[in-house]
């Protein structure tokens, strides 16, 4: 399990990054809304 070996000065990692630029779009928060009279109402 070399990935999580503890060396001094390092910690086990927990965060997940958007590493590949092509994933930027798929990791933006989804916006769900209803179009009413030309205005988007969040729902």
């Amino acid at each position: 399990d070399a990935e999580f070996r503890h060396d001094s000065g390092y910690e086990v990692h927990h965060q997940k990054l958007v590493f590949f630029a092509e994933d930027v779009g798929s990791n933006k928060g989804a916006i769900i809304g209803l179009m009413v009279g030309g205005v988007v109402i969040a729902c």
């Epitope: 990935e3 990692h13 927990h14 997940k16 990054l17 958007v18 590493f19 590949f20 630029a21 092509e22 994933d23 930027v24 798929s26 990791n27």
Partner: antibody, heavy 112, light 112 residues
């Protein structure tokens, strides 16, 4: 905690096949592109296959094109690499990687 | 494909002294979101690569603050302010702005 665990490596004869698997956990697998990267003994890092988050776009370098196939099962949080027509020069440690995280690697040895 | 060129390829260092590695890309790494997806990894002997710096200058979690990254466009630098014994290994720059993901040749850092 993010983890990537490869399996399926081993010794295979030239011309043979192997299927590598990578079990992902600790993150929303279906949102991220994934890759297989290999490292021949004493050499640098070489991308062998890349797949986008939904699995409908793949990339292979000329060295493996037509022989290797990357795929993913987002329901099972698993990445695969099907390797056919293996050659001696495919001998390497194969890593499953999301970029920021890498598995421990699985050794593939192609030899008669 | 984007070609990543590192220099030097070998770097003998003195404990407690600074060290610097350069990385140049064959084309701009600026993505449409304004970020450059240029990253630095360290691979210690017998281990998987580990992410140190992402998107030019951001330290990954758990990475000591003696590591820093800088640069823009096509020219990037990794600096270690004071080298420690645990910093030996092979450092790779890589880009993930463009498909395919590509790597530099690696810079081997060793203690004099």
């Amino acid at each position: 905690e993010v983890q990537l665990v490869e399996s399926g490596g081993g010794l295979v004869q030239p011309g043979g096949s192997l299927r590598l698997s990578c079990a992902a956990s600790g993150f929303t697998f279906s949102r991220y592109s994934m890759s297989w990267v290999r490292q021949a003994p004493g050499k640098g890092l070489e991308l062998v296959a890349q797949i986008n988050s939904v699995g409908n776009s793949t990339y292979y370098p000329d060295t493996v094109k037509g022989r290797f196939t990357i795929s993913r099962d987002n329901a099972k949080n698993t990445l695969y690499l099907q390797m056919n027509s293996l050659r001696a020069e495919d001998t390497a440690v194969y890593y499953c990687a999301s970029g920021d995280y890498w598995g421990q690697g699985t050794l593939v040895t192609v030899s008669s | 494909d984007v070609v990543m060129t590192q220099s030097p390829l070998s770097l003998p260092v003195t404990l407690g002294q600074p060290a610097s590695i350069s990385c140049r890309s064959s084309q701009s790494l600026i993505y449409s979101d304004g970020n450059a997806y240029l990253h630095w990894f360290l691979q210690k002997p017998g281990q998987s690569p580990r992410l140190l710096i992402y998107k030019v200058s951001n330290r990954f979690s758990g990475v000591p603050d003696r590591f820093s990254g800088s640069g823009s466009g096509t020219d990037f630098t990794l600096k270690i302010s004071r080298v420690e014994a645990e910093d030996v290994g092979v450092y790779y720059c890589s880009q993930s702005t463009h498909v395919p993901w590509t790597f530099g040749q690696g810079t081997k850092v060793e203690i004099k």
